[in-house]
Interface confidence: low
């Protein structure tokens, strides 16, 4: 007997890799047998050349090459999102719609977020080589190479944490050229080679004339940002010092710096950086919104001079240099739920004190914004109206709101009560994909906030905003 269509096999999220093709599967039951139609971001696919999509007899969608993508909004080199595919199975008794399947492309940027630095360590000391791999999708894995060969991670000797290589106790054999290698399905990237030198513990029986040197760290000054370094340079300071004493001049100077900890805490380990200066030098590798201690150490060959006095400097907070990640919109019970992931730590530029969420005009919500205080990464917006909902989210530090995320939209085609019963039928998609209807939204919201934590109460119809803590 006749029956309405039912989706038996839903398309799955997948990654478009290499030359392709990508396949999206959809199987449906029903009598008469339903016809299959595919939609990309809610729009039916034409399947007419030069459309790269082909429909196979069994309903499988074949994608021969990635469809053109919009511009990235978050400073990344490429947008990884190719869109959300859904299939519709229809016969004369009705239509069934599959779950949305997101197709994304593998990407690996060229530039490392943190390049490993040349280091000098003493035998027995702990040594950390930092590496911030390039942004990638999928998340790249990090491996370390030493002197052109993969480093064998011996338990208790080497640990890799967050990309950084930790050596529990430096040995003479640890000296060499270290390279951080990031890899994912899009390829691999190699960092610069960082030279690690390992010195014997200082031997006071050797002639160390340098110990007769006195070094006075006179000034630590925050440098003005260098526009040539791009729009979001990390902070750099200028150290200046004076050397006196009867000893031979030092061959080099090393800056030692660390974040200041609370009184009574054991101090953070000192980071060492060989300085390219001999009475003054620039020092980078710092983070906004931190309090730092600085000192300078002269050295010559194996001998090390006494450390200078310590100077303190508080680096101001800046607005976050990247938006929140993985912003999603989901239908809830009489509401729309916005959730996100904080920006990566190196983009915080201080303490994230909360988030600003904007709804964009020309949709089912009037233009509005909310402030979410603290570590919460969700916002529930009460509404029962069908239509399109578009939001952007920005992280907020003491300096203000950072760059907003790319707008993300949710299209609710029917009354909210049905959407809450069948939440899987409609996934979010980006503003790019609604650009025909919502062209005006590309301007984005203004970023000026008179008071970063003044909650703004917006009322329309019966909509209410609730803050929900993210566990």
């Amino acid at each position: 007997q006749d029956s309405p269509p039912q989706i038996l096999v839903h398309p799955q999220d997948q990654l478009f890799q290499g030359p392709g093709p990508a396949r999206m599967s959809c199987r449906a039951s029903g009598q008469p047998p339903p016809t299959i139609r595919w939609l990309l971001n809610g729009q039916p696919l034409s399947m007419v050349p030069p459309d790269p999509h082909h429909l196979l007899p069994d309903g499988t969608l074949l994608l021969l090459q990635p469809p053109a993508r919009g511009h990235a909004h978050d400073g990344q080199a490429l947008s990884t999102d190719l869109g959300v595919y859904t299939c519709e199975a229809s016969n004369r008794l009705g239509t069934a719609v599959s779950r949305g399947a997101r197709l994304s492309v593998a990407v690996l940027r060229e530039d490392f977020q943190i390049q490993p630095r040349d280091m000098v360590a003493v035998v027995g000391e702990q040594l950390t080589l930092e590496c911030g791999p390039p942004w990638g999708h999928p998340e790249p894995t990090v491996s370390w190479w030493k002197d052109g060969k993969p480093l064998v991670l011996q338990p208790g000797r080497y640990t890799v944490s967050g990309g950084s290589l930790l050596m529990a106790r430096a040995e003479k054999s640890d000296a060499g050229a270290y390279m951080c290698v990031a890899a994912n399905s899009a390829g691999h990237r190699e960092s610069r080679a960082a030279r690690v030198s390992i010195q014997e513990p200082q031997d006071y029986t050797e002639p160390v004339e340098l110990l007769a040197v006195r070094i006075q760290l006179e000034n630590v000054t925050l440098l003005n940002p260098d526009p040539a370094k791009g729009p979001k340079p990390g902070p750099a300071v200028w150290l200046s010092w004076k050397v006196s004493g009867p000893a031979a001049p030092a061959q080099s100077y090393t800056a030692l710096f660390r974040t200041q900890t609370a009184p009574g805490d054991q101090g953070a380990p000192w980071t060492e950086e060989l300085l390219a200066g001999w009475q003054s030098a620039e020092l980078g590798g710092l983070h906004w919104g931190q309090d730092y201690e600085f000192k300078v150490r002269p050295s010559s060959g194996r001998a090390r001079g006494p450390d200078s006095n310590v100077l303190l400097l508080r680096l101001p907070e800046k607005v976050p240099s990247a938006p929140p990640q993985e912003v999603t919109l989901k239908p809830g019970n009489g509401s729309v739920l916005v959730s996100w992931v904080p920006p990566s730590a190196e983009n915080h530029n201080g303490t994230i004190r909360g988030y600003q969420v904007w709804s964009l005009g020309n949709t089912s919500l009037p233009p509005a914004n909310w402030t979410v205080v603290g570590e919460q990464t969700q916002l529930e917006i009460a509404t029962r109206m069908p239509g399109s909902y578009c939001v952007q989210v920005a992280a907020v530090t003491g300096a203000g709101a950072g760059e907003p995320s790319s707008p993300v939209c949710l299209l609710l085609e029917q009354a909210m009560e049905r959407a809450t019963r069948e939440p899987s039928e409609h996934g979010p998609w980006t503003l790019e994909q609604l650009r025909v209807d919502l062209e005006v939204l590309f301007q984005g919201p203004g970023s000026g906030l008179n008071d970063i934590f003044e909650a703004q109460k917006i009322e329309w119809h019966e909509a209410r905003a609730h803050h929900h803590h993210h566990h």
Partner: antibody, heavy 119, light 115 residues
Framework: QIQLQESGPGLVKPSQSLSLTCSVT?????????WTWIRQFPGNNLEWMGY???????DYNPSLTSRISITRDTSRNQFFLQLESVTTQDTATYYC????????????WGQGTMVTVSS | QPVLTQSPSASASLGASVKLTCTLN???????IGWYQQHRDKPPKYVMF???????SKADGIPDRFSGSSSGADRYLTISNIQAEDEAIYFC?????????????FGSGTHFTVL
């Protein structure tokens, strides 16, 4: 792999300025290192002229301070040498170079460009 | 500032060994130096770093036939099992900081000939 390439005129008249460009590929000059000019006189003697650091700091050979300038353009990944009031004594092969590790041990060199100062 | 002294020339037979010397003036006798190799019409090539204590660190791709050592103010580059391609000028270089003046100096170079 870091690569450096010098370019500029091969002939300069006495009392004029010598201007050379070093184009860097394989590494961003604002990411690290000291971007250095070194010259080699016809008798093979090498002379360090000065550098501009990744952060924009500069140091020059004291014997050249009054007439040398090293600048950079990070957007084009290039750095530049300008030497004023040249004489025949400035005839040399000019190299750009950069250290990969210890600050003044130069792992990477350009091929060099010969500059003759003559009227 | 340091003065680096090198003998103008040296020679040795194919397969033999040679020890090239770079001498620092006494005030700078503890300083580290770098060795460079330069073939005709080519830029210098970094060979190794030799420390005042005799430790050395070779650049990538430099054969094991090259080694470095130190004695007092002398820094040595030893080439064993000499090959024809080892014929070149060898320079030493050192960086210095003297009364706030920083820089780098090179020796005058040793022309090494393979017999």
């Amino acid at each position: 792999q870091i690569q450096l390439q010098e370019s500029g005129p091969g002939l300069v008249k006495p009392s004029q300025s010598l201007s050379l460009t070093c184009s860097v590929t394989g590494y961003s000059i604002s990411s690290g290192s000291l971007w250095t000019w070194i010259r080699q006189f016809p008798g093979n003697n090498l002379e360090w002229m000065g550098y501009i650091s990744y952060a924009g700091g500069i140091d020059y050979n004291p014997s050249l301070t009054s007439r040398i300038s090293i600048t950079r353009d990070t957007s084009r990944n290039q750095f530049f040498l300008q030497l004023e009031s040249v004489t025949t004594q400035d005839t040399a092969t000019y190299y750009c170079a950069t250290p990969g590790g210890y600050p003044f041990h130069f792992d990477y060199w350009g091929q060099g460009t010969m500059v003759t100062v003559s009227s | 500032q340091p003065v680096l002294t090198q003998s103008p020339s040296a020679s040795a037979s194919l397969g033999a060994s040679v020890k090239l010397t770079c001498t620092l003036n006494s005030q700078f006798s503890t300083y580290n130096i770098g060795w460079y190799q330069q073939h005709r019409d080519k830029p210098p090539k970094y060979v190794m770093f030799v420390k005042g204590d005799g430790g050395h660190s070779k650049a990538d791709g430099i054969p094991d036939r090259f080694s470095g050592s130190s004695s007092g103010a002398d820094r040595y580059l030893t080439i064993s099992n000499i090959q024809a391609e080892d014929e070149a000028i060898y320079f030493c270089g050192a960086d210095y900081n003297n009364a706030g003046q920083y820089g780098c100096v090179f020796g005058s170079g040793t022309h090494f000939t393979v017999l």
